[in-house]
């Protein structure tokens, strides 16, 4: 396949990976799919370096990255390990309140105003960032 | 100029198969993900299904998934849609359409007519 | 999924004519929404995307606006070929779904 070399137009480089902002909201699966269709992921944040590199581009304001535990346990959505891996979350998070009354807990991941992040209703619809590896970016699949 | 181009269309009996293509050219056909929609005779839009720009993600309506398959072959800038197990009501024109990034179809092709009939 | 309503199913119309047609989505999509317009036998064409913005190339009489669950394509002067089908369509959530269609014709 062609090798791409760079991020597509509209996508900011950093550190190997392209990363996507959106400026208007949707439900986390909704977003999910969003990044899907652009041969992407939700954003997953493996190290100090990286929070402070997505928290600058997205401001105080509140958006999911790629990490949910819909199924029981934390879990990225690239398969990352959640108990070894890099964590930031605001003091008392996650707690899963159901105290929302939209029904359930909270079950999905975003950054909140300040960075640090917390679990949420994954109804909300709440700016997203999408985020590929270049390497990976460079290889086409294979013709079913 | 961008187009798109759909051939492959025609009669074909209840439980039959159909292949159809879409011919992409004036844009970088790899960086856009791409749909089908239909549209049966005197009827509203129905969206079928969407494939990412490196083929790697699909998604269907639930009335073709496990019949229909979406696929793409960028070298050729051309969009397939296999459809087998055909039935009466996947009787339409078939649109093949880009994505945008608002999740909104900015070029059409003219359609391509499958009629499904014994 | 998310269900798609237009009302009306047709309008009537002369030429200079303000039209505007309402597109009501089963659940919030906040402004995730565009307008087409199609022809008998041609492909649609988009009109508006994200609710409110307007396609390159779209004449500016034809403007959108709503957000939520409610939204509208106002045609501010109806013009000989803006005698169509219109549909609205929901890009919130996959699948995608599209409105059953407003016809615009000549009173």
């Known amino acids: 396949g062609s090798e791409r070399t760079c991020c597509p137009v509209n996508w900011v480089e950093h550190e190997r990976s392209c990363y996507w902002f959106s400026r208007s909201g949707k439900a986390w699966a909704d977003a999910d799919n969003y990044c899907r269709l652009e041969d992407a992921h939700l954003v997953v944040v493996t190290s100090w370096e990286e929070q402070k590199f997505v928290q600058h581009h997205i401001g105080p304001v509140n958006t999911w990255m790629g990490l949910h535990d819909q199924n029981g346990p934390w879990k990225w959505v690239d398969g990352t390990d959640y108990e070894t891996g890099f964590k930031n979350w605001r003091p008392e998070q996650p707690d899963d309140w159901y105290g929302h009354g939209l029904g359930g807990g909270e079950d999905c991941a975003h950054f909140t105003d300040d960075g640090r992040w917390n679990d949420d209703v994954c109804q909300r619809p709440y700016r997203w960032v999408c985020e590929t590896e270049l390497d990976k970016a460079s290889q086409e699949p294979p013709l079913l | 100029e961008v187009q798109l181009l759909e051939s492959g269309g025609g009669l074909e009996q209840p439980g039959g198969s159909l292949r159809l293509s879409c011919a992409a050219s004036g844009f970088t056909f790899s960086s856009f993900a791409m749909n089908w929609v239909r549209q049966a005779p005197g009827k509203g839009l129905e969206w079928v299904s969407v494939?990412?720009?490196?083929?790697?993600?699909?998604f269907y309506a639930d009335s073709v998934k496990g019949r229909f398959t979406i696929s793409r072959d960028n070298s050729k800038n051309t969009l397939f849609l296999q459809m087998n197990s055909l039935r009466a009501e996947d009787t339409a024109v078939y649109f093949c359409?880009?994505?945008?990034?608002?999740?909104?179809?900015?070029?059409w092709g003219q359609g391509t007519m499958v009629t499904v009939s014994s | 999924d998310i269900q798609m309503t237009q009302s009306p199913s047709s309008v009537s119309a002369s030429v200079g004519d303000r039209v505007t047609i309402t597109c009501r989505a089963s659940q919030d999509i906040t402004s995730w929404l565009a307008w087409y317009q199609q022809k008998p036998g041609k492909a649609p064409k988009l009109l508006i995307y994200a609710a409110s913005s307007l396609q390159s190339g779209v004449p500016s009489r034809f403007s959108g606006s709503g957000s939520g669950t409610d939204f509208i394509l106002t045609i501010s002067s109806l013009q000989p070929e803006d005698f169509a089908f219109y549909h609205c369509q929901q890009a919130n959530s996959i699948p995608f779904t599209f409105g059953p269609g407003t016809k615009v014709d000549i009173n």
């Open positions: 359409a880009k994505r945008t990034g608002d999740d909104v179809f900015d070029v």
């Open positions: 494939i990412s720009g490196r083929g790697g993600n699909t």
